[in-house]
Interface confidence: medium
């Protein structure tokens, strides 16, 4: 593959090829400046598979609070506003990176961790298993 | 609020209360071992608001590859398998943390960055604007 030349102004490290421990600047840069913040704010209520936003908190993790989706119904909302159990509301999950304090309670030492979070819900056709 | 006692075995840092630069171990711990990775793998096809997954790649970012959802239709799939334009397929977006190499091309120095990604799609009732 392409090898990008190493910037001569980089901080020193013992292993240039595969850093196990790296320095991370926590001043978060936000790439979302051009997004319209209103656009997905009420989907949780307007969806045919609506969800609630539930607090998942862990003081030893950054971010310490993650809002997780919990589908309100097993079925989906039909045109009449009723729950249709011929369809299923299911959570859309995503693996995200978080920082975990390691050793515990240390303010400046972390380990990268992957966690699975539910972001919202979608309405799917159920898988029907036919019994022979 | 509660102050968690600082672990005496922590690495040194200049500012104990608000670290700007921290050490991060990149050996990822995965908390998702008990989850079934196939569980939501086919929702993108079975959803009434189906989506395609597009590769978003950036070698200066960790993770360098992120799969982004793009809704297939403006409307939603109805019971007959047709697209119903009285409903809208919309992307469910989530802010996620990534590591951005800083300075560029440095293997062991990063900055925390928040980016907005589309994880999947959901079917919503449209907002109807009535003209007076």
């Amino acid at each position: 593959g392409i090898t990008i030349p190493r910037n001569p102004g980089c901080p020193n490290s013992e292993d240039k090829n595969f850093p196990r421990t790296v320095m991370v600047n926590l001043n978060i840069h936000n790439r979302n400046t051009n997004t319209n913040p209103k656009r997905s704010s009420d989907y949780y209520n307007r969806s045919t598979s609506p969800w609630n936003l539930h607090r998942n908190e862990d003081p030893e993790r950054y971010p310490s609070v993650i809002w997780e989706a919990k589908c309100r119904h097993l079925g989906c909302i039909n045109a009449d506003g009723n729950v249709d159990y011929h369809m299923n509301s299911v959570p859309i999950q995503q693996e995200i990176l978080v920082l975990r304090r390691e050793p515990p309670h240390c303010p400046n030492s972390f380990r990268l961790e992957k966690i699975l979070v539910s972001v919202g819900c979608t309405c799917v056709t159920p898988i029907v298993h036919h019994v022979a | 609020g509660i102050t968690i006692p600082r672990n005496p075995g922590c690495p040194n840092s200049e500012d104990k209360n608000f670290p700007r630069t921290v050490m991060v171990n990149l050996n990822i711990h995965n908390r998702n071992t008990n989850t079934n990775p196939k569980r939501s793998s086919d929702y993108y096809n079975r959803s009434t608001s189906p989506w395609n997954l597009h590769r978003n790649e950036d070698p200066e970012r960790y993770p360098s590859v992120i799969w982004e959802a793009k809704c297939r239709h403006l409307g939603c799939i109805n019971a007959d398998g047709n697209v119903d334009y009285h409903m809208n397929s919309v992307p469910i977006q989530q802010e996620i943390l990534v590591l951005r190499r800083e300075p560029p091309h440095c293997p062991n120095s990063f900055r925390l960055e928040k980016i907005l990604v589309s994880v999947g799609c959901t079917c919503v009732t449209p907002i109807v604007h009535h003209v007076a």
């Epitope: 936000n30 979302n32 997905s40 003081p59 310490s64 809002w67 | 609020g1 670290p19």
Partner: antibody, heavy 124, light 107 residues
């Protein structure tokens, strides 16, 4: 000193607009989700809106949805509430509040810092 | 939305009395509950967070307990400066919701 200072309130006619601001100081604003909460005269507290630390997630109370827009400028350490199509029932003291979720930095608890409030009166 | 039912809506007590206010959530909120004090013309002040943790600088006569759906706020020995309205607030689910308030007066 950790502080929130609201401004932009005043008297406005029904159907009119106002933009409230909340200037933060004494803490790293960009790390904290923020809220607007209001209190009608002689009434209880009512949550109005939420915005995530970088502005990518916003949530509104049903009573203001489609009329109010919460936003933030992290470079200016300022939170905003754009209020359109104002109604008499929007008359209230409007407070901004910080959700101190950054406990990993050993700070306090949710809604630990509030501004002093700015009064919005909607009347003809 | 989660409903928070606070009781009583008002109460009158004497200096030195033990005062108890209850708050009931319409569904399980774990311990994600705050208690606030609000004096006339002032912004709310956080007293208790996570149901039972005393915020820094708050006198120890204030305490909180409970989890799930039932919560209690207690002032062990009422002082004249405690005259205020007290609110519970859940922050387990968005939208965040408050109790309707309890107005505390001195007899």
């Amino acid at each position: 000193e950790v502080q929130l200072l609201e401004s932009g309130g005043g008297l406005v006619q029904p159907g009119g607009s106002l933009r409230l601001s909340c200037a933060a100081s004494g803490f790293t604003f960009s790390f904290y989700p923020m809220y607007w909460v209001r209190q009608a005269p002689g009434k209880g507290l009512e949550w109005v809106s939420y915005i995530s630390s970088s502005g990518g997630m916003t949530i509104y109370a049903d009573s203001v949805k489609g009329r109010f827009t919460i936003s933030r400028d992290n470079s200016k350490n300022t939170l905003y509430l754009q209020m359109n199509s104002l109604r008499a029932e929007d008359t209230a003291m409007y407070y901004c509040a910080r959700e101190s979720v950054a406990r990993w930095l050993q700070s306090g608890a949710a809604f630990d810092i509030w501004g002093q409030g700015t009064m919005v009166t909607v009347s003809s | 939305n989660i409903q928070m039912t606070q009781s009583p809506s008002s109460l009158s007590a004497s200096v030195g009395d033990r005062v108890t206010i209850t708050c009931q959530a319409s569904q399980d909120i774990g311990t994600f509950l705050n208690w606030f004090q609000q004096k006339p013309g002032r912004a709310p002040k956080l007293l208790i967070y996570d149901a039972s943790n005393l915020e820094t600088g708050v006198p120890s006569r204030f305490s909180g307990s409970g989890s799930g759906t039932d919560f209690t706020f207690t002032i062990s020995s009422l002082q004249p400066e405690d005259i205020a309205t007290y609110y519970c607030q859940q922050y387990d689910y968005l939208p965040i919701t408050f109790g309707q308030g309890t107005r505390l007066e001195i007899k």
